[in-house]
């Protein structure tokens, strides 16, 4: 089990169902890091689709939260067919205070 103590947490969210079913819409997988401390100046995101790294994600400016920590969001645009076919999306979060990078994986429920 992870020994993580007081560090950031990572949540990975699927695209909205409507976005995956309508070709006119843009489905996105969203990686959210919360409880980022003021002493952690940067958070690095790496994204993988079926184990292959991709570089088209967009990281939004960090937002200060009410509890004096930051929230950082990275968004990966996915291909409709890739999501519907069950491809696996992994978000890896790292910085020089995270000795064990945090990884979260998501795919369309079978």
């Amino acid at each position: 089990a992870p020994e993580l103590l007081g560090g950031p947490s990572v949540f990975l969210f699927p695209p909205k169902p409507k976005d995956t079913l309508m070709i006119s819409r843009t489905p996105e997988v969203t990686c959210v890091v919360v409880d980022v401390s003021h002493e952690d100046p940067e958070v690095k995101f790496n994204w993988y689709v079926d184990g292959v790294e991709v570089h088209n994600a967009k990281t939004k400016p960090r937002e200060e939260q009410y509890n004096s920590t930051y929230r950082v969001v990275s968004v990966l645009t996915v291909l409709h067919q890739d999501w519907l076919n069950g491809k696996e999306y992994k978000c890896k979060v790292s910085n020089k205070a995270l000795g064990a990078p945090i990884e979260k994986t998501i795919s369309k429920a079978k």
């Epitope: 103590l5 950031p8 020089k96 205070a97 000795g99």
Partner: antibody, heavy 119, light 109 residues
């Protein structure tokens, strides 16, 4: 309990090579960055380099780049340091060190292995 | 390569407070340097105390705290104990490598 055990040190002639190993136990080795740090006799610490859990990134001390190579085998829970073109100034105790999940980058240390470069 | 400078030696009385500092030759130390503090006890026993400027490692007593102070990284020991007598090293991160300071020999006397 985290345990790191270095081996492979010894006496080597200038210009020679040596491969050090660090056997890890008591934690999920494949999740963590790992470091090599050295300490020359009677001197302070010098960082040698580090490697990501998946070996995708390896960083070295600028002064050592090119002569030293860090690698790992997650299946064997082992970290390695290949040292080539050794010089007298490489004489030191070499330690592997593991970060904590969050915070301390040099949290857990091995007992070290002594490398002596001399003719 | 950057040079990281520490006080060569400091003395503190038992129960007293002392601050060890870590200066960078490249300018002010910031959170981007992810300051770490390592304790060396006799027989080359090393323990990481603090990382990421101010995050205590598990097992690090609460009397140790990390901070940035006047452009330097600082390790403050409040309520020194005899067992805190040791060598203390700081390490700073510079984009793609770490640099250790020369160490501070702390005497509890």
């Amino acid at each position: 309990e985290v345990q790191l055990v270095e081996s492979g040190g010894g006496l080597v002639q200038p210009g020679g090579s040596l491969r050090l190993s660090c056997a890890a136990s008591g934690f999920t080795f494949s999740r963590y960055w790992m470091n090599w740090v050295r300490q020359a006799p009677g001197k302070g610490l010098e960082w040698v380099g580090e490697i990501t859990p998946d070996s995708s990134t390896i960083n070295y001390a600028p002064s050592l780049k090119g002569r030293f190579t860090i690698s790992r085998d997650n299946a064997k829970n082992s970290l390695y340091l290949q040292m080539n073109s050794l010089r007298a100034e490489d004489t030191a105790v070499y330690y592997c060190a593991r970060p904590y999940d969050y915070g301390a980058w040099f949290a857990s240390w091995g007992q070290g292995t002594l490398v002596t470069v001399s003719s | 390569q950057a040079v990281v400078t520490q006080e060569p030696s400091l003395t503190v009385s038992p129960g007293g407070t002392v601050t060890l500092t870590c200066r960078s030759s490249t300018g002010a130390v910031t959170t981007s340097n992810y300051a770490n503090w390592v304790q060396e006890k006799p027989d080359h026993l090393f323990t990481g105390l603090i990382g990421g400027t101010n995050k205590r490692a598990p097992g690090t007593p609460a009397r140790f705290s990390g901070s940035l102070l006047g452009g330097k990284a600082a390790l403050t020991l409040s309520g020194a104990q005899p067992e805190d007598e040791a060598e203390y090293y700081c390490a700073l991160w510079y984009s793609n490598h770490w640099v250790f300071g020369g160490g501070t020999k702390l005497t509890v006397l």
